[in-house]
Protein backbone atom coordinates (compact mmCIF):
# COMPACT_ATOMS: atom_id res chain seq x y z
CA UNK A 1 0.00 0.00 0.00
CA UNK A 2 1.19 3.49 -0.78
CA UNK A 3 -0.21 6.82 0.43
CA UNK A 4 -0.61 9.30 -2.40
CA UNK A 5 -2.05 12.15 -0.37
CA UNK A 6 -1.34 12.52 3.34
CA UNK A 7 -3.68 14.37 5.70
CA UNK A 8 -2.64 17.96 6.40
CA UNK A 9 -2.14 19.47 9.85
CA UNK A 10 -4.48 22.25 10.93
CA UNK A 11 -4.47 25.00 13.56
CA UNK A 12 -8.12 25.82 14.20
CA UNK A 13 -10.41 27.49 16.72
CA UNK A 14 -12.36 25.39 19.19
CA UNK A 15 -15.68 24.29 17.71
CA UNK A 16 -14.49 24.26 14.09
CA UNK A 17 -15.19 21.52 11.58
CA UNK A 18 -12.12 20.05 9.85
CA UNK A 19 -11.93 17.48 7.06
CA UNK A 20 -8.79 15.34 6.83
CA UNK A 21 -8.06 13.67 3.48
CA UNK A 22 -6.06 10.51 2.95
CA UNK A 23 -5.59 8.92 -0.47
CA UNK A 24 -3.88 5.57 -1.01
CA UNK A 25 -3.31 3.05 -3.76
CA UNK A 26 -2.15 -0.55 -4.13
CA UNK A 27 -2.97 -4.00 -5.46
CA UNK A 28 -5.39 -5.01 -4.14
CA UNK A 29 -6.98 -1.68 -3.21
CA UNK A 30 -6.01 -0.95 0.41
CA UNK A 31 -8.38 -0.25 3.27
CA UNK A 32 -7.97 2.96 5.26
CA UNK A 33 -8.43 3.28 9.01
CA UNK A 34 -8.07 6.41 11.12
CA UNK A 35 -6.43 6.57 14.54
CA UNK A 36 -6.86 9.45 17.02
CA UNK A 37 -4.09 9.78 19.62
CA UNK A 38 -3.30 6.07 19.32
CA UNK A 39 -6.92 4.88 19.57
CA UNK A 40 -9.70 4.28 17.08
CA UNK A 41 -11.43 7.52 16.15
CA UNK A 42 -14.25 7.96 18.68
CA UNK A 43 -16.24 10.65 16.89
CA UNK A 44 -16.47 12.19 13.46
CA UNK A 45 -17.77 10.88 10.16
CA UNK A 46 -15.81 8.99 7.53
CA UNK A 47 -16.61 8.99 3.83
CA UNK A 48 -14.81 6.80 1.31
CA UNK A 49 -14.69 6.50 -2.44
CA UNK A 50 -12.73 4.11 -4.66
CA UNK A 51 -11.78 4.78 -8.28
CA UNK A 52 -9.12 3.13 -10.46
CA UNK A 53 -7.42 1.29 -7.59
CA UNK A 54 -7.22 4.54 -5.59
CA UNK A 55 -9.07 4.89 -2.29
CA UNK A 56 -9.92 8.33 -0.94
CA UNK A 57 -10.96 8.64 2.71
CA UNK A 58 -12.29 11.83 4.28
CA UNK A 59 -12.58 12.17 8.04
CA UNK A 60 -14.76 15.07 9.19
CA UNK A 61 -14.19 16.20 12.77
CA UNK A 62 -15.79 18.66 15.17
CA UNK A 63 -12.74 19.97 17.00
CA UNK A 64 -12.97 20.17 20.78
CA UNK A 65 -9.42 19.17 21.64
CA UNK A 66 -5.98 18.94 20.04
CA UNK A 67 -4.94 15.58 18.65
CA UNK A 68 -2.75 13.47 16.41
CA UNK A 69 -4.70 11.82 13.61
CA UNK A 70 -3.10 8.94 11.70
CA UNK A 71 -4.25 7.49 8.42
CA UNK A 72 -3.30 3.81 8.01
CA UNK A 73 -3.57 2.20 4.57
CA UNK A 74 -3.38 -1.60 4.60
CA UNK A 75 -3.60 -4.30 1.93
CA UNK A 76 -2.70 -7.99 1.80
CA UNK A 77 -0.66 -9.93 -0.79
CA UNK A 78 -1.29 -13.56 0.03
CA UNK A 79 -0.12 -13.92 3.61
CA UNK A 80 1.83 -10.65 3.64
CA UNK A 81 0.39 -7.35 4.89
CA UNK A 82 1.57 -4.04 3.52
CA UNK A 83 0.95 -0.93 5.60
CA UNK A 84 1.56 2.77 5.02
CA UNK A 85 0.96 5.51 7.60
CA UNK A 86 0.65 9.29 7.50
CA UNK A 87 -0.20 11.59 10.38
CA UNK A 88 -1.51 15.10 10.89
CA UNK A 89 -1.85 17.21 14.00
CA UNK A 90 -4.87 19.26 14.93
CA UNK A 91 -4.04 22.06 17.32
CA UNK A 92 -6.41 24.56 18.85
CA UNK A 93 -5.52 28.18 18.22
CA UNK A 94 -5.54 30.51 21.18
CA UNK A 95 -8.75 32.48 20.93
CA UNK A 96 -9.81 35.71 22.57
CA UNK A 97 -11.92 34.71 25.53
CA UNK A 98 -15.46 36.11 26.06
CA UNK A 99 -14.37 38.68 28.63
CA UNK A 100 -11.88 40.09 26.13
CA UNK A 101 -14.10 39.88 23.08
CA UNK A 102 -17.68 40.88 23.75
CA UNK A 103 -19.01 39.69 20.41
CA UNK A 104 -22.02 37.59 21.20
CA UNK A 105 -25.62 37.49 22.27
CA UNK A 106 -27.59 36.68 25.39
CA UNK A 107 -29.99 33.79 25.71
CA UNK A 108 -31.55 31.55 28.28
CA UNK A 109 -29.27 28.62 29.13
CA UNK A 110 -30.80 25.65 27.32
CA UNK A 111 -28.05 23.13 27.97
CA UNK A 112 -27.91 20.24 30.40
CA UNK A 113 -24.42 20.06 31.92
CA UNK A 114 -24.60 23.32 33.87
CA UNK A 115 -28.32 23.25 34.59
CA UNK A 116 -27.90 22.41 38.29
CA UNK A 117 -25.03 24.88 38.73
CA UNK A 118 -26.27 28.07 37.04
CA UNK A 119 -28.98 30.25 38.54
CA UNK A 120 -32.49 29.14 37.60
CA UNK A 121 -33.52 30.25 34.12
CA UNK A 122 -30.09 31.86 33.76
CA UNK A 123 -29.54 34.30 30.94
CA UNK A 124 -26.04 33.62 29.64
CA UNK A 125 -23.60 35.15 27.18
CA UNK A 126 -23.01 33.14 24.00
CA UNK A 127 -19.77 33.89 22.22
CA UNK A 128 -20.19 34.30 18.46
CA UNK A 129 -16.53 33.56 17.76
CA UNK A 130 -17.99 30.03 17.54
CA UNK A 131 -20.07 28.99 14.56
CA UNK A 132 -22.68 27.49 16.90
CA UNK A 133 -22.07 29.14 20.29
CA UNK A 134 -24.57 27.08 22.30
CA UNK A 135 -23.28 23.75 21.02
CA UNK A 136 -19.61 24.72 21.22
CA UNK A 137 -19.78 26.13 24.75
CA UNK A 138 -21.82 23.17 25.97
CA UNK A 139 -19.30 20.79 24.41
CA UNK A 140 -16.43 22.66 26.01
CA UNK A 141 -18.05 22.36 29.44
CA UNK A 142 -18.96 18.73 28.84
CA UNK A 143 -15.40 17.81 27.88
CA UNK A 144 -13.89 19.65 30.84
CA UNK A 145 -16.60 18.30 33.18
CA UNK A 146 -15.46 14.74 32.45
CA UNK A 147 -11.97 15.64 33.67
CA UNK A 148 -13.47 16.75 36.98
CA UNK A 149 -14.56 13.19 37.77
CA UNK A 150 -11.08 12.46 39.11
CA UNK A 151 -10.82 15.42 41.51
CA UNK A 152 -11.61 15.33 45.23
CA UNK A 153 -15.19 15.64 46.56
CA UNK A 154 -14.22 18.97 48.15
CA UNK A 155 -12.87 20.39 44.89
CA UNK A 156 -15.45 19.06 42.45
CA UNK A 157 -18.56 21.18 43.24
CA UNK A 158 -16.45 24.33 43.47
CA UNK A 159 -14.68 23.55 40.21
CA UNK A 160 -17.98 22.77 38.47
CA UNK A 161 -19.42 26.11 39.59
CA UNK A 162 -16.30 27.94 38.42
CA UNK A 163 -16.28 26.12 35.09
CA UNK A 164 -19.95 26.70 34.28
CA UNK A 165 -19.94 30.34 35.34
CA UNK A 166 -16.75 30.98 33.39
CA UNK A 167 -17.84 29.39 30.12
CA UNK A 168 -21.50 30.41 30.41
CA UNK A 169 -21.03 33.87 31.87
CA UNK A 170 -24.01 35.75 33.17
CA UNK A 171 -25.39 38.30 30.73
CA UNK A 172 -25.27 41.88 31.93
CA UNK A 173 -28.50 43.89 31.56
CA UNK A 174 -27.97 46.69 29.08
CA UNK A 175 -28.20 47.87 25.50
CA UNK A 176 -25.07 45.92 24.49
CA UNK A 177 -24.87 42.21 25.39
CA UNK A 178 -21.98 41.95 27.84
CA UNK A 179 -20.68 38.97 29.81
CA UNK A 180 -20.16 39.33 33.54
CA UNK A 181 -16.90 37.64 34.57
CA UNK A 182 -16.54 35.76 37.85
CA UNK A 183 -15.25 37.82 40.76
CA UNK A 184 -11.53 37.32 41.38
CA UNK A 185 -12.13 36.43 45.02
CA UNK A 186 -14.37 33.46 44.12
CA UNK A 187 -11.90 32.24 41.52
CA UNK A 188 -9.07 32.42 44.08
CA UNK A 189 -11.18 30.59 46.66
CA UNK A 190 -11.57 27.68 44.25
CA UNK A 191 -7.91 27.79 43.26
CA UNK A 192 -6.34 28.22 46.69
CA UNK A 193 -8.89 26.75 49.07
CA UNK A 194 -11.11 24.07 47.55
CA UNK A 195 -8.86 22.84 44.74
CA UNK A 196 -5.36 23.83 45.87
CA UNK A 197 -3.82 20.39 45.33
CA UNK A 198 -5.51 19.79 41.96
CA UNK A 199 -4.66 23.28 40.70
CA UNK A 200 -1.01 22.80 41.62
CA UNK A 201 -0.81 19.49 39.76
CA UNK A 202 -2.56 20.96 36.73
CA UNK A 203 -0.29 24.02 36.58
CA UNK A 204 2.81 21.88 37.01
CA UNK A 205 1.79 19.60 34.16
CA UNK A 206 0.90 22.56 31.97
CA UNK A 207 4.27 24.25 32.63
CA UNK A 208 6.12 21.03 31.79
CA UNK A 209 4.12 20.77 28.59
CA UNK A 210 2.62 17.43 29.58
CA UNK A 211 -0.96 18.52 29.86
CA UNK A 212 -2.34 20.96 27.35
CA UNK A 213 -5.91 19.76 27.13
CA UNK A 214 -8.71 22.07 26.11
CA UNK A 215 -9.87 22.38 29.70
CA UNK A 216 -6.71 24.15 30.71
CA UNK A 217 -6.39 26.20 27.56
CA UNK A 218 -9.94 27.47 27.54
CA UNK A 219 -11.97 26.45 30.56
CA UNK A 220 -10.06 27.68 33.60
CA UNK A 221 -9.97 31.43 34.16
CA UNK A 222 -6.82 33.26 35.13
CA UNK A 223 -7.91 34.58 38.52
CA UNK A 224 -5.49 37.51 38.48
CA UNK A 225 -7.12 38.88 35.32
CA UNK A 226 -10.62 38.88 36.77
CA UNK A 227 -12.20 41.98 38.35
CA UNK A 228 -12.35 42.24 42.12
CA UNK A 229 -15.70 42.47 43.86
CA UNK A 230 -14.21 45.36 45.84
CA UNK A 231 -13.75 47.50 42.72
CA UNK A 232 -17.36 47.39 41.62
CA UNK A 233 -19.74 44.81 43.13
CA UNK A 234 -21.87 44.78 39.98
CA UNK A 235 -18.93 44.26 37.58
CA UNK A 236 -18.44 40.60 38.44
CA UNK A 237 -20.47 37.52 39.29
CA UNK A 238 -20.43 35.76 42.66
CA UNK A 239 -20.52 31.98 42.73
Amino acid sequence: ARILRAPESHNVTFGSFVTLHCTATGIPVPTITWIENGNAVSSGSIQESVKDRVIDSRLQLFITKPGLYTCIATNKHGEKFSTAKAAATISIAEWSKPQKDNKGYCAQYRGEVCNAVLAKDALVFLNTSYADPEEAQELLVHTAWNELKVVSPVCRPAAEALLCNHIFQECSPGVVPTPIPICREYCLAVKELFCAKEWLVMEEKTHRGLYRSEMHLLSVPECSKLPSMHWDPTACARL
Epitope: G104, Y105, C106, A107, D121, L123, P173, G174, V175, V176
Partner: antibody, heavy 118, light 108 residues
Amino acid sequence: QVHLVQSGAEVKKPGASVKVSCKASGYTFTGYYMHWVRQAPGQGLEWMGWINPYSGGTSYAQKFQGRVTMTRDTSISTAYMELSRLISDDTAVYYCASGLGISAFDIWGQGTMVTVSS
Amino acid sequence: SYVLTQPPSVSVAPGQTARITCGGNNIGSKSVHWYQQKPGQAPVLVVYDDSDRPSGIPERFSGSNSGNTATLTISRVEAGDEADYYCQVWDRSSDHYVFGTGTKVTVL
Protein backbone atom coordinates in the same frame (compact mmCIF):
# COMPACT_ATOMS: atom_id res chain seq x y z
CA GLN B 1 -33.36 55.53 24.17
CA VAL B 2 -34.49 51.93 23.65
CA HIS B 3 -37.51 51.53 21.37
CA LEU B 4 -39.46 48.87 19.50
CA VAL B 5 -41.66 50.45 16.84
CA GLN B 6 -44.22 48.28 15.08
CA SER B 7 -46.02 48.64 11.74
CA GLY B 8 -49.56 49.98 11.53
CA ALA B 9 -52.96 48.30 11.90
CA GLU B 10 -54.04 45.76 9.31
CA VAL B 11 -57.41 44.46 8.11
CA LYS B 12 -57.31 41.07 6.42
CA LYS B 13 -59.76 38.58 4.97
CA PRO B 14 -59.96 34.99 6.26
CA GLY B 15 -57.39 32.76 4.55
CA ALA B 16 -55.02 35.66 3.87
CA SER B 17 -51.62 36.32 5.50
CA VAL B 18 -50.36 39.26 7.52
CA LYS B 19 -46.78 40.40 8.09
CA VAL B 20 -46.04 42.66 11.06
CA SER B 21 -42.71 44.44 11.43
CA CYS B 22 -40.88 45.54 14.58
CA LYS B 23 -37.97 47.98 14.27
CA ALA B 24 -35.50 48.06 17.17
CA SER B 25 -33.39 51.05 18.12
CA GLY B 26 -31.17 52.12 20.99
CA TYR B 27 -29.65 48.70 21.65
CA THR B 28 -27.74 45.89 19.93
CA PHE B 29 -30.47 44.21 17.89
CA THR B 30 -28.52 40.96 17.37
CA GLY B 31 -27.73 40.69 21.08
CA TYR B 32 -31.12 39.66 22.40
CA TYR B 33 -33.95 37.34 21.35
CA MET B 34 -37.09 38.94 19.96
CA HIS B 35 -40.43 37.49 21.05
CA TRP B 36 -43.92 37.89 19.65
CA VAL B 37 -46.96 37.97 21.93
CA ARG B 38 -50.58 38.46 20.95
CA GLN B 39 -53.71 39.51 22.79
CA ALA B 40 -57.20 38.92 21.46
CA PRO B 41 -59.87 41.50 22.46
CA GLY B 42 -60.73 41.08 26.15
CA GLN B 43 -58.37 38.13 26.45
CA GLY B 44 -54.99 37.47 28.06
CA LEU B 45 -51.46 37.51 26.68
CA GLU B 46 -50.37 34.60 24.48
CA TRP B 47 -46.72 33.90 23.59
CA MET B 48 -46.25 33.01 19.92
CA GLY B 49 -42.52 32.37 19.59
CA TRP B 50 -39.06 33.86 19.41
CA ILE B 51 -36.35 34.59 16.87
CA ASN B 52 -32.64 34.83 17.57
CA PRO B 53 -31.72 37.91 15.51
CA TYR B 54 -28.06 36.88 15.44
CA SER B 55 -28.53 33.45 13.89
CA GLY B 56 -32.09 33.60 12.56
CA GLY B 57 -32.99 30.56 14.67
CA THR B 58 -36.62 30.34 15.80
CA SER B 59 -38.89 28.57 18.26
CA TYR B 60 -42.66 28.69 17.88
CA ALA B 61 -45.50 27.87 20.25
CA GLN B 62 -47.10 24.59 19.23
CA LYS B 63 -50.41 26.32 18.54
CA PHE B 64 -48.86 28.41 15.75
CA GLN B 65 -46.50 25.83 14.27
CA GLY B 66 -46.88 25.66 10.50
CA ARG B 67 -48.72 28.99 10.34
CA VAL B 68 -46.22 31.45 11.76
CA THR B 69 -42.87 32.52 10.30
CA MET B 70 -40.50 34.83 12.13
CA THR B 71 -37.68 36.48 10.20
CA ARG B 72 -35.33 39.40 10.64
CA ASP B 73 -33.26 41.88 8.64
CA THR B 74 -30.19 42.75 10.70
CA SER B 75 -29.16 45.55 8.32
CA ILE B 76 -32.20 47.57 9.41
CA SER B 77 -32.59 46.06 12.92
CA THR B 78 -36.07 44.81 12.13
CA ALA B 79 -37.91 41.63 13.08
CA TYR B 80 -40.95 40.32 11.21
CA MET B 81 -43.81 38.02 12.15
CA GLU B 82 -45.93 36.55 9.38
CA LEU B 83 -49.12 34.64 10.18
CA SER B 84 -50.81 32.75 7.36
CA ARG B 85 -54.22 31.16 6.80
CA LEU B 86 -55.88 33.76 8.99
CA ILE B 87 -59.18 33.06 10.73
CA SER B 88 -61.42 35.41 12.70
CA ASP B 89 -59.91 34.14 15.98
CA ASP B 90 -56.59 35.68 14.90
CA THR B 91 -58.07 39.13 15.41
CA ALA B 92 -55.76 40.53 18.09
CA VAL B 93 -53.12 43.05 19.02
CA TYR B 94 -49.69 41.64 18.14
CA TYR B 95 -46.70 42.77 20.22
CA CYS B 96 -42.98 42.30 19.76
CA ALA B 97 -40.99 42.20 23.01
CA SER B 98 -37.44 41.62 24.20
CA GLY B 99 -35.42 41.30 27.38
CA LEU B 100 -32.22 43.33 27.49
CA GLY B 101 -30.03 41.16 29.65
CA ILE B 102 -32.79 39.81 31.87
CA SER B 103 -34.94 36.73 31.38
CA ALA B 104 -38.17 38.75 31.25
CA PHE B 105 -39.58 41.04 28.54
CA ASP B 106 -38.57 44.51 29.64
CA ILE B 107 -39.18 46.30 26.34
CA TRP B 108 -42.34 46.06 24.26
CA GLY B 109 -43.53 47.44 20.96
CA GLN B 110 -46.66 49.59 20.95
CA GLY B 111 -48.68 46.75 19.40
CA THR B 112 -50.23 46.19 15.98
CA MET B 113 -53.97 45.60 15.68
CA VAL B 114 -54.78 42.89 13.13
CA THR B 115 -58.46 42.47 12.26
CA VAL B 116 -59.59 39.41 10.33
CA SER B 117 -63.01 39.94 8.84
CA SER B 118 -64.86 38.92 5.70
CA SER C 1 -47.87 22.09 28.38
CA TYR C 2 -47.19 24.19 31.48
CA VAL C 3 -50.21 26.04 32.92
CA LEU C 4 -50.26 29.13 35.15
CA THR C 5 -53.46 29.88 37.06
CA GLN C 6 -54.39 33.31 38.43
CA PRO C 7 -57.56 34.52 40.16
CA PRO C 8 -59.70 36.44 37.64
CA SER C 9 -60.06 39.48 39.90
CA VAL C 10 -58.83 41.07 43.11
CA SER C 11 -60.45 44.10 44.77
CA VAL C 12 -58.61 46.30 47.22
CA ALA C 13 -59.20 49.61 48.97
CA PRO C 14 -56.70 52.47 48.48
CA GLY C 15 -53.80 52.27 50.95
CA GLN C 16 -54.34 48.55 51.53
CA THR C 17 -52.29 45.60 50.25
CA ALA C 18 -53.20 43.56 47.17
CA ARG C 19 -51.86 40.04 46.73
CA ILE C 20 -52.09 38.30 43.38
CA THR C 21 -51.24 34.62 43.19
CA CYS C 22 -49.92 32.59 40.29
CA GLY C 23 -50.16 28.81 40.61
CA GLY C 24 -48.12 26.31 38.67
CA ASN C 25 -46.60 22.88 39.20
CA ASN C 26 -43.31 23.37 41.12
CA ILE C 27 -43.26 27.02 40.04
CA GLY C 28 -40.67 27.70 42.75
CA SER C 29 -38.04 26.08 40.52
CA LYS C 30 -38.71 28.67 37.80
CA SER C 31 -38.12 32.41 37.57
CA VAL C 32 -41.45 34.26 37.65
CA HIS C 33 -42.04 37.65 36.03
CA TRP C 34 -44.99 39.98 36.51
CA TYR C 35 -46.48 42.47 34.06
CA GLN C 36 -48.96 45.30 34.53
CA GLN C 37 -51.23 46.19 31.62
CA LYS C 38 -53.56 49.16 31.51
CA PRO C 39 -56.36 49.41 28.90
CA GLY C 40 -55.08 50.21 25.42
CA GLN C 41 -51.44 49.99 26.44
CA ALA C 42 -48.62 47.49 26.06
CA PRO C 43 -47.69 45.45 29.15
CA VAL C 44 -45.06 46.85 31.53
CA LEU C 45 -42.67 44.64 33.50
CA VAL C 46 -43.06 45.32 37.24
CA VAL C 47 -41.19 42.38 38.82
CA TYR C 48 -38.75 39.92 37.27
CA ASP C 49 -36.84 36.85 38.49
CA ASP C 50 -39.35 36.33 41.32
CA SER C 51 -38.59 39.50 43.28
CA ASP C 52 -36.39 41.97 41.36
CA ARG C 53 -37.77 45.33 40.26
CA PRO C 54 -36.83 47.13 37.04
CA SER C 55 -35.69 50.73 37.48
CA GLY C 56 -38.62 53.13 37.73
CA ILE C 57 -40.95 50.62 39.39
CA PRO C 58 -41.99 51.71 42.92
CA GLU C 59 -40.85 49.68 45.95
CA ARG C 60 -44.53 49.04 46.66
CA PHE C 61 -44.34 46.22 44.09
CA SER C 62 -42.69 43.06 45.40
CA GLY C 63 -42.71 39.38 44.56
CA SER C 64 -42.09 36.00 46.12
CA ASN C 65 -42.03 32.47 44.77
CA SER C 66 -41.88 29.04 46.39
CA GLY C 67 -43.49 25.64 46.08
CA ASN C 68 -46.44 25.79 43.71
CA THR C 69 -47.33 29.46 44.14
CA ALA C 70 -45.78 32.79 43.17
CA THR C 71 -47.19 36.01 44.61
CA LEU C 72 -47.13 39.63 43.50
CA THR C 73 -47.73 42.00 46.39
CA ILE C 74 -48.76 45.62 45.88
CA SER C 75 -48.59 47.52 49.16
CA ARG C 76 -50.21 50.90 49.82
CA VAL C 77 -52.36 50.49 46.72
CA GLU C 78 -53.10 53.63 44.67
CA ALA C 79 -55.82 54.32 42.12
CA GLY C 80 -53.17 54.20 39.35
CA ASP C 81 -52.45 50.56 40.16
CA GLU C 82 -55.81 49.53 38.72
CA ALA C 83 -54.89 47.27 35.78
CA ASP C 84 -54.57 43.69 34.58
CA TYR C 85 -51.60 41.74 35.97
CA TYR C 86 -50.00 38.72 34.34
CA CYS C 87 -47.41 36.29 35.64
CA GLN C 88 -45.04 34.63 33.18
CA VAL C 89 -42.40 31.88 33.22
CA TRP C 90 -40.10 30.09 30.82
CA ASP C 91 -40.93 26.39 30.60
CA ARG C 92 -37.50 24.88 30.11
CA SER C 93 -38.76 21.44 29.03
CA SER C 94 -40.67 22.80 26.03
CA ASP C 95 -38.59 25.98 25.56
CA HIS C 96 -41.86 27.89 25.57
CA TYR C 97 -42.79 31.05 27.43
CA VAL C 98 -46.06 30.87 29.31
CA PHE C 99 -48.33 33.63 30.60
CA GLY C 100 -50.80 33.31 33.42
CA THR C 101 -54.51 33.77 32.84
CA GLY C 102 -54.38 37.34 34.17
CA THR C 103 -55.88 39.10 37.19
CA LYS C 104 -57.90 42.31 37.08
CA VAL C 105 -57.07 44.51 40.07
CA THR C 106 -59.83 46.92 41.01
CA VAL C 107 -59.17 49.77 43.43
CA LEU C 108 -62.37 50.41 45.36
